[in-house]
């Protein structure tokens, strides 16, 4: 297991225990309980108090990271007396051995890369392992393909994201024969880590007075519909003086993605490219391939 648990309790103990796999804190049920409460306090003195489970002898923490160390606390009142117990959950191991600079990104709608760096005080034989649990905590994903640097795991590639949900818990454990290695954990929203592909099927059709650009929204990992997208069009006249500003047009996502603009014949050679973003985050994709229209002698 990744950490030592130390109990601070009065004489008659509630036998408080914490399961880091399920994030479930439980204790011995007391007869004639009138009041129960559980919470944790982190190193920044933030308090998290989850809803109690139905049987009132356990509670489940959903959105928490543990690598900075936390203290769990349970208060129980019965008709006879009150109980109180603390459970320290430190991140044991040598300081500075945990994986650092951890980040993940989803790309191509169904692939994910996570990367990290070895801790500055980690010994040469350190090995890191990545585990991912979705917010429903139904299953744990172990990294299937590690990225290595001199034999040490410093990244992970996943080509099956079916086990993920909108918010996921990432845990990087470490092992060494020499010393204890601290763990690192993080909660990540898939919507914040997805990098969109550029829009597809970009076409330009022109008549004598106008040009109509059409495109399809990119395929994404998240369940997004047309209103969730924002697009930027770069309509660019070819062979212009360097430093001439491109025309960047913002277009909201629609059922039929199109942009109609005046452009009369004869028209000079132009190019258009499009990029996409989540309308709420504006994390822009790369540009689509430039499509050319018009003629050199326009």
């Amino acid at each position: 297991e990744k950490s030592d648990l130390r109990t601070v309790a009065p004489a008659s103990s509630l036998n408080v225990r914490f399961d880091s796999r399920t994030m479930n804190l439980s204790w011995d049920c007391q007869e004639n309980t009138t009041f129960s409460k559980c919470f944790l306090t982190d190193k920044k003195n933030r308090v998290v108090e989850p809803r109690l489970s139905n049987n009132e002898c356990s509670c489940t923490f959903r959105e928490i990271c543990l690598h900075e160390g936390v203290t769990f606390e349970v208060h129980v009142n019965t008709s006879q007396r009150g109980f109180q117990q603390k459970l320290l959950y430190p991140n044991s191991g040598r300081e500075g051995t945990a994986a650092q600079n951890f980040s993940c990104f989803i790309y191509n709608a169904d692939l994910m890369n996570c990367t990290w760096a070895r801790g500055p005080t980690a010994p040469r034989d350190v090995q890191y392992f990545l585990y991912i649990r979705n917010s429903k905590r139904r299953r744990e994903i172990r990294c299937p393909y590690y990225i290595q640097d001199s034999g040490t795991h410093v990244g992970c590639h996943l080509d099956n994201l079916s086990g993920l949900t909108s918010r996921n818990y990432f845990l990087v454990n470490g092992t060494s024969r020499e010393i204890g290695i601290q763990f690192f954990d993080s909660l990540l929203d898939t919507k914040k880590i997805e990098r969109f592909n550029p829009p597809s099927n970009v076409t330009v059709r022109c008549n004598t007075t106008h040009c109509l650009v059409r495109w399809k929204q990119p395929r994404t990992y998240q369940k997004l519909s047309y209103l969730d997208f924002q697009y930027q069009l770069d309509v660019h006249r070819k062979n212009t003086q360097p430093g001439t500003e491109n025309l960047l047009i913002n277009v909201s996502g629609d059922l039929e993605n199109r942009y109609n603009f005046p452009s009369s014949e004869p028209r000079a050679k132009h190019s258009v490219k499009i990029r996409a973003a989540d309308v709420r985050i504006l994390n822009w994709s790369s540009w689509s391939e430039a499509i050319e229209f018009g003629s050199d002698d326009g």
């Epitope: 919507k191 369940k223 997004l224 519909s225 209103l227 969730d228 059922l255 709420r280």
Partner: antibody, heavy 120, light 111 residues
Framework: QVQLVQSGAEVKKPGASVKVSCKIS????????IHWVRQTPTKGFEWMGG????????VYAQRFQGRVTMTEDTSIDTAYLTLSSLRSDDTAVYYC?????????????WGKGTMVTVSS | QAVLTQPSSVSGAPGQRVTISCTGS?????????VSWYQQLPGTAPKLLIY???KRPSGVPDRFSASKSGTSASLAITGLQAEDEADYYC???????????FGGGTKVTVL
Amino acid sequence: QVQLVQSGAEVKKPGASVKVSCKISGHSLSELSIHWVRQTPTKGFEWMGGFDPEENEIVYAQRFQGRVTMTEDTSIDTAYLTLSSLRSDDTAVYYCSIVGSFSPLTMGLWGKGTMVTVSS
Amino acid sequence: QAVLTQPSSVSGAPGQRVTISCTGSGSNIGAPYDVSWYQQLPGTAPKLLIYHNNKRPSGVPDRFSASKSGTSASLAITGLQAEDEADYYCATSDEILSGSVFGGGTKVTVL
């Protein structure tokens, strides 16, 4: 131009079933998520359910579970709503809609509605 | 009983500014979920007016704007016009009820 064309008004007796259709034109149903919402003068708008791409199945509002069935025929771009064991308080206008966003559920485009009257 | 609370009616003279409030709770607007607004002209189907708290679909005039704070949201119509006379509904998602939840609607009358 994308449009949702709904079937005509229905009058049904209590205990009967009703099937409302919603034909999509100008777009392929297989690329869309259709949800159903009803409107009554007393309860206002009530979301009934629809296709959830994350679960890859049709999900139903709890209060209609067991009485409602939503189906789709992508070959003719048509969605259907069947409500059984009708009661007088099911008298409502039933709308199909195209989901514009899933978070939160946002109806981007609505059909004109189908009036269903339940009366003995 | 609607999950989201709106005033039953508001009114204003042409050219005036009117606002409609929408109050929810910690399981919906405060969860936090974005808010949408729909306009329903007499005898017609609803039309999406605002999505993701303050975004307008193409074709919706910029006289319509909206904002959200905490567990409530509001819709503002500036430069009120006769054609704005309609029912307006707020909507969002709810953690407990799941799916979409709506306000009871606000009738806007142009005096």
